[in-house]
């Protein structure tokens, strides 16, 4: 079952409560507005370095510049995760590491940065112009991803400077994150406030049909507003990616083109406090992906007003493997 963010339908205030309600309506937008303005925007940086000793060996370093706690890091190559990118490693701050050839060694450098060394030989070694992406899932900011690659003229042993260039992803809560939700709330409440000022309070009509007020679904943007913001991904070089087969034989080089193993996007897990709380049975995690809370098992339908979702052409399980197929 999916639990959606819901707002009660607007009901006229009771006559006796009008003063208190009016006062509350005045205070709330300003509180929210303050929060909106002060909410910081996190960033992800990516640094790609070619080792001087092994010319086809790469070191990728990624970091998260934000105040939230990181719940998962996914490193991929060939483009953003879930957009044709192939997972190289998944790092969880408490649960450990899963990685895939040609990754040689993934590790945490600090609480908010990781490094990944890639093997330099064999059919699965990266091309010099490969794009590497790092996706940080954090609470409460959501998911943020940035990509980087070696500059064309890189000398061995030199590294590309860190690139804090996050790619906008509609399945990432970080697009608006908390501040986006608050901003929407601010605008909405200011709109209510204006209407409330210009209209006398009508009499309360008791509902004859239902004891509970009808509920309006939050975050259901129109097609027009969905189309309002569409940021394309960075160009992805796929020249060194073989095709997949039903029979996955790694003879003649490991089958590294695996995309994420299955079960992470389509069953998102709650990034909150994994370290300290006992983990509930599978399927009961709470997701903060997309900025809305939803019971794990189904994705929330929309990210927010005015945002275009980037559905994965491979279907709901395309993001799978962050943890190596389930």
């Amino acid at each position: 079952m999916r639990t959606e963010a819901q707002v009660p339908a607007l009901q006229p205030p009771e006559p006796g409560l009008e003063g208190a309600m009016g006062h509350r309506t005045l205070v709330l937008p300003w509180v929210l507005l303050t929060l909106c303005v002060t909410a910081g925007t996190p960033e992800v940086w990516v640094q790609v370095r070619m080792e001087a000793t092994e010319l086809s060996s790469f070191t990728i370093r990624c970091g998260f510049l934000g105040s939230g706690s990181i719940s998962l890091v996914t490193v991929s190559w060939g483009g953003p995760n879930g957009a044709g990118g192939t997972t190289l490693a998944v790092l969880h701050p408490e649960r450990g590491i899963r990685q895939w050839a040609p990754a040689r060694q993934a590790r945490w450098e600090t609480q908010s940065s990781i490094s990944l060394i890639l093997e330099g030989s064999g059919a699965s070694s990266p091309c010099a112009n490969t794009t590497f992406c790092c996706k940080f899932a954090s609470f409460p900011e959501g998911s943020w991803e940035a990509c980087g690659s070696l500059p064309p003229s890189s000398d061995p042993g030199l590294s590309a400077p860190p690139t804090p260039a996050p790619i906008l992803r509609a399945d990432l809560a970080g697009i608006l994150g908390v501040s986006g939700v608050l901003l929407f709330g601010c605008v909405y409440l200011l709109h209510l406030l204006r209407r409330h000022k210009h209209r006398p309070a009508p009499r309360l009509q008791p509902s004859r049909t239902s004891p509970q007020a009808p509920r309006a679904r939050a975050w259901a943007p129109s097609q027009a507003s969905q189309a309002a913001l569409h940021v394309p991904y960075a160009t992805i070089n796929t020249s060194c990616r073989p095709a997949t087969l039903d029979t996955a034989h790694p003879h003649g080089g490991p089958s590294w083109w695996a995309s994420l193993p299955t079960h992470a996007a389509h069953r998102p897990q709650g990034p909150a406090a994994w370290a300290s709380t006992p983990i509930p049975a599978r399927g009961s995690f709470v997701s903060v992906e997309n900025g809305l809370y939803a019971q794990a098992g189904e994705r929330p339908p929309h990210t927010g007003p005015g945002l275009t979702l980037f559905p994965d052409p491979r279907g709901p399980r395309a993001m799978e493997g962050p943890l190596g197929v389930r």
Epitope: T86, T87, H92, P93, E94, R95, G96, I97, R98, Q99, W100, A101, Q105, R107, T244, L245, A248, H249, P250, P254, S255, W256, W257, A258, S259, L260, P261, T262, H263, A264, R267, Q269, A275, P278, I279, R282, F285, R317, E320, G321, P322, L323, G324, V325, R326
Partner: antibody
Framework: EVQLQQSGPELLKPGSSVNISCKAS????????IDWVKQSRGKSLEWIGA????????FYNQKFKGQATLTVYKSSSTAYMELRSLTSEDSAVYYC????????????WGTGTAVTVSS | DIVMTQSQKFMSTSVGERVSITCKAS??????VDWYQQKPGQSPKALIY???NRHTGIPDRFTGSGSGTDFTLIISNVQSEDLADYFC?????????FGGGTKLEIT
Amino acid sequence: EVQLQQSGPELLKPGSSVNISCKASGYTFTDYNIDWVKQSRGKSLEWIGAINPNNGGTFYNQKFKGQATLTVYKSSSTAYMELRSLTSEDSAVYYCVRWDSDSWYFDVWGTGTAVTVSS
Amino acid sequence: DIVMTQSQKFMSTSVGERVSITCKASENVRAAVDWYQQKPGQSPKALIYLASNRHTGIPDRFTGSGSGTDFTLIISNVQSEDLADYFCLQHWNYPYTFGGGTKLEIT
């Protein structure tokens, strides 16, 4: 019921190769990684490597790299491990195990395949 | 490689007793430790994952605790069917490594 049914015992000569199979049933094969574990007699367990049945992505313990090769056939929901250049040190029980990436552990173990290498 | 040390190779206990099996990691592995039980002639099976979470169907007599480098599996009210080898596993970093095992004997 979720099961990982492995192929039967093998008696082999030094220098030969063996292909151990692991047939999955009771779940969607491509939804879970398959890892392989070695248990030598009187010894503990050793992790060999992992394969993602969705796409064939692999990762090996350096100790077994070059000797073990992991493959999958999605159509028959079967994982395979080939061991080459066998020596008496390779005599052991080999297990395929299912990795649950929601909770990060080996939730289902195969029936085990005993491999004996003897001249 | 991370070394997982189970210092007690053998432990002897009686039915109804409480027993603690320990596992020490050579470096900080956070909560990335699981416990597996292997009865004679059988494949191992999952008991505890991520240090303290019981696998489906495991009785609450089995409790896991610890984080960092020291981990404990406690079996309270030991039953005769608990006669088995118990292994810890770390998946904090590659290669994943198992402890040497503790054989629990019931007297």
